[in-house]
């Protein structure tokens, strides 16, 4: 091989070793019968060499760097070549460095022809093995702008002081073109912008310069994205770290087109926009790092670019045409709001009137979609009312509780499904009766399904909550005097799943005075956990609330309460309570303004508990908690 | 796997003369250079000679130079470093080291003492 | 001869903490320096070959750079098993080889 190098070009020529392989035999460049490992060629030098081994490939690596000084001179913009040419270079794996000196005064632009560049992040390499490493300078400070490969979307990087631009070629490719040129700008007045094209849809991961080491301090670096107007694009930040700021804050700012209050200011914690209609700017600024313990500053993000969101172009058919009394509302599920600007999320009617809100009313179709960055950010919340006017027509008529499929496909989360359950006053009352037994929630044994009951008077001047109950428990029914929401709320995306698990069908019956039943059917496999209504805020006055506990005739069920004394204390009346043998009648009176709790008893038959308020002085409430466990009896008693 | 094991330290009265071996495993001796590298109690490292088998080439440092020679036998696949004319000042632990991608393998040094 | 001369000789670090030590060729060398890390009683082992390349078996966190005839060893977080001595070497078949005076990173 010969390489020749012009006088004045600048030019470097370095074969050394690569990559330590673990190949039997070393390989030599052999140059007038020295065995080197290294051969450096400057400006104005002609050398002769041969390799000592066939595939010097495996062994060597081949660095040509020019460099450009336009310091002194007039700097040669344009098109950038290869040089040497490297049909005349050995076939070695290539790197071709441009190193160039500028003004800080003076912007510097690299074009990239398509193919455009996609960056890549430590620990990732390109799949043709052609690299674009790019680095500019601060003062004497290298700083690497990011690794690139093609068939991506940066189209230029603007830098101001210098740039210096790797070029790596695999020894076995065929580029003999250097794909990018050089041109001159004016003053950028920051570390560097990267301006990224989207033709169509795409996505495009980039990363603060030095990433992952840390930005350098107190400096700014621009992204601009290029977007056709008719897509739409979503920021979501992949990785992040904060330094330690003394003065300033690190943050992002966005120039979004349409907005009135432009640059909207993000902190990098934050929810990055979503749903952005075209061009956007996306800058990251730094702060004055604490000298003792300045941490780094980095960030690693994806744009994505897709047409208004795939949600957009579904249409969804929600058929409220046989339906009565209900109401159907999606909208944004409240969220801690820490900056000003929100990316758009909309439910769209028709496809047309989108808004951040939607009513649909029973009684007909509705044909709804979204446009909307994340539909996690909205939920459903459904009403309906169940009424009976004529005692006589509803009697022990029967309503199934469930949430209708048409719902359950849409992508939105159902959050509360709330059925408003009216009877005529003083001729009937309710009963609810689940597919699955029914388990009420208490601090002892919480509730861990995706869903659950929440029973609650329904009287405008009655504040009454019965309590939460969800499916796997011991009430095999729950009677009420008088009107009451039943509201099915969710707790986990898993309630799809589980939807088939709920179940409730109610049925008006006659009127009882008690405000309400419980019917409880333990299991002999589990301790059942029982609450008064309206825990922590105590039983209302004068209100009365009865457990119908059944006992198989093989179990003995212990009755234990989990406070000395009910701590209640009354301003007017007594407050008592009664457990009664169903089969006996026998039954115990305790006060309980009075007498402490009874100690754990052991009941043979089933039996009832009645508890029953006076009217207390506030802040010495009624509540009680009580569970009932089944053995097997070690005794016939009969 | 590549190995180098020195032997022939000790203790020599100035003026006498030491022979050094550094026997290779895991590697043929005559594709690489090979050298040796001194380190004096509590100091630096101080290259002393290279050889590359292959083409019998040598090369010492101005200290040694004319008192030490470096030879190998690439049938035992071994490199010597004979001392000569020893003085107080070559004190110091001798490695050998094998050179290709700078000196990439060491041995564990053989302590060579000069002293009356 | 081409003498390296390295800075500074010793230094004070903690774990964690990002440490730099340089050496500068009297005249130019190339990319032909190599940096070696040495533990009392112990051979020298090669970190970095051609200035930057970092040798197999080596942890990423060792790195090394080159700027006209500066040559800089950076360790960017410093573990307790770094605690060591580390030497330059010019080794560019410009004989004689030689060595920097060697910098001792201590634990502060």
């Known amino acids: 091989f010969e390489i020749a190098l012009p006088r004045e070009s600048n030019i470097t020529v370095l074969i050394k070793l690569g990559t330590p392989t673990l190949l039997a035999k070393p390989c030599y460049i052999v140059i007038s019968k020295r065995h080197i490992t290294m051969l450096s060629i400057k400006s104005g030098e002609r050398i002769v060499f041969t390799f000592s081994c066939q595939s010097p490939e495996n062994h060597f690596v081949i660095e040509i760097q020019k460099n450009i000084d336009c310091m002194s001179g007039p700097c040669p913009f344009g098109e950038v070549q290869l040089q040497p040419s490297t049909s005349l270079l050995p076939t070695l794996n290539r790197t071709f460095i441009w190193d160039v000196k500028a003004h800080k005064s003076i912007g510097l632009e690299l074009q990239f022809s398509i193919p455009r560049l996609r960056q890549i992040g430590p620990g990732e390499s390109c799949p043709d093995g052609v690299t674009h490493s790019i680095s500019g300078r601060i003062d004497a400070t290298v700083v690497r702008i990011g690794t690139f490969c093609s068939n991506g979307t940066v189209s230029r990087i603007k830098m101001q002081e210098g740039v210096k631009m790797a070029l790596h070629l695999p020894w076995f490719h065929p580029r003999n073109v250097s794909g990018f040129s050089i041109a001159n700008r004016s003053s950028i007045k920051r570390l560097c912008i990267i301006e990224s094209v989207f033709e169509g849809e795409g996505s495009a991961t980039l990363m603060s310069a030095n990433y992952p080491e840390g930005f350098p301090e107190d400096e700014l670096m621009t992204w601009q994205f290029v977007v056709p107007a008719h897509l739409r694009a979503s920021v979501s930040f992949l990785n992040f770290n904060l330094s330690n700021c003394e003065r300033k804050e690190e943050r992002v700012e966005y120039y979004i087109p349409g907005s009135t209050t432009n640059p909207e200011v993000f902190k990098l914690e934050d929810k990055q926009p979503g749903n952005m209609a075209g061009n956007f700017n996306l800058s990251l600024q730094g702060c004055d790092q604490d000298a003792q313990s300045p941490g780094i500053l980095r960030l690693q993000f994806q744009v994505l670019v897709q047409h208004p969101q795939n949600e957009s172009n579904k249409i969804y058919v929600v058929d409220l045409s046989n339906e009565r009394a209900m109401s159907l509302t999606i909208e944004p599920r409240p969220v801690k709001q820490s900056r000003k600007f929100v990316p758009g999320c909309f439910v769209c009617l028709e496809s047309r009137t989108c808004s951040s809100n939607l009513t649909l009313t029973s009684g007909s179709k509705h044909k709804i979609s979204f446009l909307c960055d994340d539909l996690t950010r909205l939920w459903m919340n459904v009403e309906k009312t169940i009424s009976c006017t004529d005692h006589r027509y509803c009697q022990r008529k029967s309503y199934s509780l469930q949430v209708p499929s048409d719902i359950l496909h849409l992508p939105v989360e159902l959050h509360d499904f709330s059925w408003k359950l009216l009877v005529p006053k003083d001729r009937l009352s309710l009963v609810l009766v689940p597919a699955q037994k029914l388990q009420q929630h208490t601090h002892e044994k919480p509730c861990n399904t995706s869903f659950s009951y929440l029973v609650a008077s329904a009287i405008p001047s009655q504040d009454l909550y019965f309590g939460s109950f969800c499916p796997g428990g011991s009430i095999k029914q729950i009677q009420v005097k008088q009107n009451i929401s039943v509201t099915l709320r969710t707790f986990a995306p898993s309630f799809q799943q589980e939807a088939s698990r709920q179940g409730l069908t109610v049925s008006f019956i006659p009127y009882f005075k008690e405000e309400g039943v419980f019917t409880v059917t333990p299991d002999t496999k589990s301790k059942v956990y029982l609450r008064t209504p309206n825990w922590d805020r105590g039983l209302p006055s004068l209100t009365s609330v009865s457990w119908n506990i059944s006992v198989p005739r093989d179990q003995v069920a212990c009755l234990t309460f989990f406070k000395e004394r009910s701590g209640v204390v009354c301003q007017t009346g007594r407050a008592f309570m009664i457990i009664q043998e169903q089969r006996t009648r026998a039954e115990e009176i305790f006060s309980l303004d009075e007498d402490v709790l009874p100690k754990p008893s052991f009941h043979h038959h089933s039996f009832w508990v009645n508890i029953s308020n006076c009217s207390p002085t506030s802040g010495k409430q009624l509540d009680l908690l009580f569970s009932v466990t089944l053995t097997p009896r070690t005794v016939d008693l009969t | 796997e590549v190995q180098l094991v020195e032997s022939g330290g000790g203790l020599v009265q100035p003026g006498g003369s030491l022979r050094l071996s550094c026997a290779a495993s895991g590697f043929n001796i005559s594709s690489y250079y090979m050298h040796w590298v001194r380190q004096a109690p509590g100091k630096g490292l101080e290259w002393v000679a290279s050889?590359?088998?292959?083409?019998?080439?040598?090369y010492y440092a101005d200290s040694v130079k004319g008192r030490f020679t470096i030879s190998a036998d690439t049938s035992k696949n071994t490199a010597y470093l004979q001392m000569n004319s020893l003085r107080a000042e070559d004190t110091a632990v001798y490695y050998c080291?094998?050179?290709?991608?700078?000196?990439?393998?060491w041995g564990q040094g053989t302590l060579v003492t000069v002293s009356s | 001869d081409i003498q390296m001369t390295q800075s500074p000789s010793s230094l004070s670090a903690s774990v964690g903490d990002r440490v730099t030590i340089t050496c500068r060729a009297s005249?130019?060398?190339?990319?032909?320096v190599a940096w070696y890390q040495q533990k009392p009683g112990k051979a020298p082992k090669l970190l970095i070959y051609s200035a930057s390349s970092l040798y197999s078996g080596v942890p990423s966190r060792f790195s090394g750079s080159r700027s006209g005839t500066d040559f800089t060893l950076t360790i960017s977080s410093l573990q307790p098993e770094d605690f060591a001595t580390y030497y330059c070497q010019q080794s560019y078949y410009v004989y004689p080889i030689t060595f920097g005076q060697g910098t001792k990173v201590e634990i502060k």
């Open positions: 005249q130019s060398v190339s990319s032909a």
């Open positions: 050889i590359y088998p292959y083409s019998g080439y040598t």
């Open positions: 080291a094998r050179a290709y991608y700078a000196m990439d393998y």
